[in-house]
Interface confidence: low
Amino acid sequence: GALEVQVPEDPVVALVGTDATLCCSFSPEPGFSLAQLNLIWQLTDTKQLVHSFAEGQDQGSAYANRTALFPDLLAQGNASLRLQRVRVADEGSFTCFVSIRDFGSAAVSLQVAAPYSKPSMTLEPNKDLRPGDTVTITCSSYQGYPEAEVFWQDGQGVPLTGNVTTSQMANEQGLFDVHSILRVVLGANGTYSCLVRNPVLQQDAHSSVTITPQRSPTGAVEVQVPEDPVVALVGTDATLRCSFSPEPGFSLAQLNLIWQLTDTKQLVHSFTEGRDQGSAYANRTALFPDLLAQGNASLRLQRVRVADEGSFTCFVSIRDFGSAAVSLQVAAPYSKPSMTLEPNKDLRPGDTVTITCSSYRGYPEAEVFWQDGQGVPLTGNVTTSQMANEQGLFDVHSVLRVVLGANGTYSCLVRNPVLQQDAHGSVTITGQPMTFPPEA
């Protein structure tokens, strides 16, 4: 009969910029040689050629040189395709066509995803707020895919649906920046939270702002920084916000601004004698020179590293002086967990198996939760280890030992406590005897 070609039923989810494997397998007959094999990968809808193997040779990538086969595994029936540096435009269905004596094909879906950044919150107006004032709160989250769902709520968790305007704009790579605007009338004080959800990654990113209307005290220079830590993703740029109120007639010649590490007093950046004296912090800091005259003393920290985490002091001296400290909390999202099973062949009910859940390059340390198909937590026989690499990013490996029932689903959830990002993987073990991953 026709050749049976097997691919995963569920879409393959791949993060933008990572590599994805589109699994495809067939059952080679005894005496099969690669000279007999014709393998074609193509886009299902357009029939565009992606990669091929014919006449005993890999014919190479026809898809922007970003695809590869697994040549050493072809003879065993593994026709999987590696797609490198995944882009949004890659999303869709790929057909794996295998011809030996007979032929067969199957289509595998690629679902592309990108985590949304922790939302940044801005307030307009942001000074001299009094109860009864109308304010516009903007929640912005960047570079995610697919389009996000946005939810607002107040400090009591009550959803806020009125006066919300949400817009999502795709950039040239197809990644979305989401901006959601809430207009509210201030009470005596209030907390407003914005949650940005990635429906594919089931990743929730949220931020909140607490507004306490009050009059500013007079006297010394009042230096204002955010109460909450600034959360920055590793490798991105962070703005440590700091502002002061310039008096009428203020000129930059009067300003002395010093940023330093709070604990060690190490100089980070300074502006004195009317001039930006530059970065003393690995050339990764910058001020906003055009905004200094308006009282914006914020610091831009580029290419954030785990080692940057901590407290930074903003010291402003004009005639009087003042200072305030802002905390930088560094974070990195955990990758979608990969699941492995040991043993992974000929499994029968009653067998003890070890399921390993691995998630990579996150920060800070993750919380790991296991549960069964009914959502019941599995806490016994779990060993979780987290190792930091030289950049301080953690790889987490959690091992669950279970005795198999007739069938069962085991889910692992890796939570980033700072980003409030949940990444999860699951494995379903059914039937007997069985093999994992399923073989052709």
Epitope: D19, Q84, R85, R303, N389, E390, Q391
Partner: antibody
């Protein structure tokens, strides 16, 4: 402290191949780009190609395409550059270099002199 | 393939003088441009990355500027240890392919 240590000098015959190694210590090997740059006697710097070990992707200058192969062994934190079909004009000092973040080469190996002579 | 041209080929200056080295790309390289210094018998040393950022440990007398196709390395006041060959290097966005310029030799007048 990041260090790149290259293999020793080589004398090769025209038409043969040479494989130079570059062992990295300090920093996470996989996360940085490794470049290979050569310099013929009295000449300028010439970028041959590079690899990002974590991706396993090598890129080559057009001039060397098909003649150079750059690989990386993450388990030993070692990068390799193999140049085939050697000719006398390939006589040069070959350097490996590594970035601090991104691509720019902050750290360089000590150089390996390859002499191609009949 | 992007070609880099450096001028002048040789710059003869006295200590304390200002050195201005130019690098021109055959097409725009945004700010993906680095400057390296090389002394005889030594490996090159990164001075400037992303057109204008000083690398760690590089003295403030070195500065870089420019974007697109025209870039400048300035040494505000030459020190004896600055006499060397200076190379500019560009990087394409993806794939990351690099090209060096032919170099400018700064020697003592």
């Amino acid at each position: 402290q990041v260090q790149l240590v290259q293999s020793g000098a080589e004398v090769k015959k025209p038409g043969s191949s040479v494989k130079v190694s570059c062992k990295a210590s300090g920093g996470t090997f996989s996360s940085y780009a490794i470049s290979w740059v050569r310099q013929a006697p009295g000449q300028g710097l010439e970028w041959m190609g590079g690899i990002i070990p974590i991706l396993g992707i090598a890129n080559y200058a057009q001039k060397f395409q098909g003649r150079v192969t750059i690989t990386a062994d993450e388990s030993t934190s070692t990068a390799y550059m193999e140049l085939s079909s050697l000719r006398s004009e390939d006589t040069a000092v070959y350097y490996c270099a590594r970035g601090d973040s991104g691509y720019d080469s902050n750290y360089w190996g000590q150089g390996t002199l390859v002499t191609v002579s009949a | 393939e992007i070609v880099l041209t450096q001028s002048p080929a040789t710059l003869s200056l006295s200590p304390g003088e200002r050195a201005t080295l130019s690098c021109r790309a055959s097409q725009s390289v945004s700010t993906y441009l680095a400057w390296y210094q090389q002394k005889p018998g030594q490996a090159p040393r990164l001075l400037i990355y992303d057109a204008s950022n000083r690398a760690t440990g590089i003295p403030a007398r070195f500065s870089g500027s420019g974007s697109g196709t025209d870039f400048t390395l300035t040494i505000s006041s030459l020190e004896p240890e600055d006499y060397a060959v200076y190379y500019c290097q560009q990087r394409s966005n993806w794939p990351p392919l690099f090209t060096f310029g032919p170099g400018t030799k700064v020697d003592i007048k």
